[in-house]
């Protein structure tokens, strides 16, 4: 008996061919011998089956001895053996209909689990193999689970159901809701304007939720909420903002925050959380601010950085176009009795300059000038 696999919601055409290339009498029945459809001369007739409004034929091919059964909007319960009776012969076709659905929503937060559930007809023993957009293969039976979804899991998952050495393929689009970057770091000279950006790694028609930026300043004993905001259909509105610092926030996505001035007391790290409507859990992005200050007090030229720097970062003081006078893996360096000229304070990582501040040292009879 011929086996045909179908997909829930799809259409299937079961073929039935007579040896005579002309329109003759035919009937399609199910395993309970209930008539689905057939012909009476050149007329299509339908029986009392549950397929009544979803089953049809291809009238135009009857004259050529072809009498297909076309079933629209397949259901799991359409799985059955279908019998075509034509010319005193019986052609049997076993139809097995499968469905594959994601557990809840196909929009999941980073770190959440994805469960795919296979709907299959009684008596079938299918195997399922799914391939993620990043090429990871998972196998299973009636359910497949992937824990700790990552950003790279966003995209089309292709799942193949195997039964009776035949296969049917499902494609499921999964969107992992996350920020593009888990963490970012901004390096600024004291007094400069600071821009924080929090681009999302997904696009959806309507985006609604609320968010907050908590900030842990390096100099402070506890963290505090700098700003809270609402997101409605991709429009951002500020709910509450601290007086110091007075952050400004962009009205459109991507989420964008502006700190008017980088000051040592603001250096530290923040955590922006975004709670999306109808989702359990929150999106997170860490943001760090490193602030540099170069000063000259009497005979001491000092360069300092505040904020979360890695121990491998190098802080240097050098006179322009000369070798570094001092270079240390520390957060403050200084030079006593500096020569007159333009001094540079550099924060670098493996030779790459991350932050630079210049200070002009005047001959000893004058006061220093910061350009």
């Amino acid at each position: 008996k011929k086996v045909v696999l179908g997909k829930k919601g799809d259409t299937v055409e079961l073929t039935c061919t007579a040896s005579q290339k002309k329109s003759i009498q035919f009937h399609w029945k199910n395993s309970n011998q209930i008539k689905i459809l057939g012909n009476q001369g050149s007329f299509l007739t339908k029986g009392p089956s549950k397929l009544n409004d979803r089953a049809d034929s291809r009238r135009s091919l009857w004259d050529q001895g072809n009498f297909p059964l076309i079933i629209k909007n397949l259901k799991i319960e359409d799985s059955d053996t279908y019998i075509c009776e034509v010319e005193d012969q019986k052609e049997e076709v076993q139809l097995l209909v499968f469905g594959l659905t994601a557990n809840s929503d196909t929009h999941l937060l980073q770190g959440q689990s994805l469960t795919l559930t296979l709907e299959s007809p009684p008596g079938s023993s299918p195997s399922v193999q799914c391939r993620s957009p990043r090429g990871k293969n998972i196998q299973g039976g009636k359910t497949l689970s992937v824990s700790q979804l990552e950003l790279q899991d966003s995209g089309t998952w292709t799942c193949t159901v195997l039964q009776n050495q035949k296969k049917v393929e499902f494609k499921i689009d999964i969107v992992v809701l996350a920020f593009q970057k888990a963490s970012s770091i901004v390096y600024k000279k004291e007094g400069e304007q600071v821009e924080f950006s929090f681009p999302l790694a997904f696009t959806v028609e309507k985006l609604t939720g609320s968010g907050e930026l908590w900030w842990q300043a390096e100099r402070a004993s506890s963290s505090k909420s700098w700003i809270t905001f609402d997101l409605k259909n991709k429009e951002v509105s500020v709910k509450r903002v601290t007086q110091d610092p007075k952050l400004q926030m962009g009205k459109k996505l991507p989420l964008h925050l502006t700190l008017p001035q980088a000051l040592p007391q603001y250096a530290g790290s923040g955590n922006l959380t975004l709670a999306l409507e109808a989702k359990t859990g929150k999106l997170h992005q860490e943001v760090n601010l490193v602030v540099m200050r170069a000063t000259q007090l009497q005979k001491n030229l000092t360069c300092e950085v505040w904020g979360p720097t890695s121990p491998k970062l190098m802080l240097s003081l050098k006179l322009e176009n000369k070798e570094a006078k001092v270079s240390k893996r520390e957060k403050a360096v200084w030079v006593l009795n500096p020569e007159a000229g333009m001094w540079q304070c550099l924060l670098s990582d493996s030779g790459q300059v991350l932050l630079e501040s210049n200070i002009k040292v005047l001959p000893t009879w004058s006061t220093p000038v910061q350009p």
């Epitope: 997909k7 055409e13 135009s60 076309i70 049917v168």
Partner: antibody
Framework: QVQLVQSGAEVKKPGASVKVSCKAS????????ISWVRQAPGQGLEWMGI????????SYAQKFQGRVTMTRDTSTSTVYMELSSLRSEDTAVYYC???????????WGQGTLVTVSS | DIQMTQSPSSLSASVGDRVTITCRAS??????LNWYQQKPGKAPKLLIY???SLESGVPSRFSGSGSGTDFTLTISSLQPEDFATYYC?????????FGPGTKVDIK
């Protein structure tokens, strides 16, 4: 929903043959028939023929009998339509479409322009 | 072969108008008739199958009626996106045949 993606435009000389492909995705390829329909510039639609789900049976319009061959490759979910002995009046956009019989042609390819010119 | 004719071959209408296109078969095709919409440079789109059944996703302002040899496609309130060419098609017998089309443009 089923997507049908056709091969690119072709320019052929009179007397030559052209083979247009139609790759299906999103549905179960071996479960539905494919019809081919063409449309000459500024003209209406003209049905060329049909290939059944198993690929075992084809039916062609009398006008194209002997010149057209429709085949399907289940391993790549692709249907092919080859038209031979081309003449200038075969210049047209050729469409493949999922044929659900009396339910109509519900999904169409984007079309392939075949230009026959000496 | 069954010949399909359509009338009018073209018509001008305004947004909000009720538009009726007729299709006639040279012999009875019972209810084996489909309607398609085609926009310039695009593939046709199925609107109505078996004379009066609305294809999934097609706006309810489209409706079809008729059986035997005479059929009608009605757009109850023409929308800007409805300006296109409309074709009828019979699936009663091989060869499948289409009507010559009715072009609906802006008045």
């Amino acid at each position: 929903q089923v997507q049908l993606v056709q091969s690119g435009a072709e320019v052929k000389k009179p007397g030559a043959s052209v083979k247009v492909s139609c790759k299906a995705s999103g549905g179960t390829f071996s479960n539905y028939a494919i019809s081919w329909v063409r449309q000459a510039p500024g003209q209406g639609l003209e049905w060329m023929g049909i290939i059944d789900p198993s690929g075992g049976s084809t039916s062609y319009a009398q006008k194209f009998q002997g010149r057209v061959t429709m085949t399907r490759d289940t391993s790549t979910s692709t249907v092919y339509m080859e038209l031979s002995s081309l003449r200038s009046e075969d210049t047209a956009v050729y469409y493949c479409a999922r044929d659900l019989g009396d339910y109509g042609l519900d999904s169409w390819g984007q079309g392939t322009l075949v230009t026959v010119s000496s | 072969d069954i010949q399909m004719t359509q009338s009018p071959s073209s018509l001008s209408a305004s947004v909000g108008d009720r538009v009726t296109i007729t299709c006639r078969a040279s012999q009875t095709i019972r209810s084996y008739l489909n309607w398609y919409q085609q926009k310039p440079g695009k593939a046709p789109k199925l609107l109505i199958y078996k004379a009066s059944s609305l294809e999934s996703g097609v706006p309810s302002r489209f409706s079809g009626s008729g059986s035997g040899t005479d059929f009608t496609l009605t757009i109850s309130s023409l929308q800007p996106e409805d300006f296109a060419t409309y074709y009828c098609q019979q699936t009663y017998t091989i060869p499948i045949t289409f009507g010559p089309g009715t072009k609906v443009d802006i008045k």
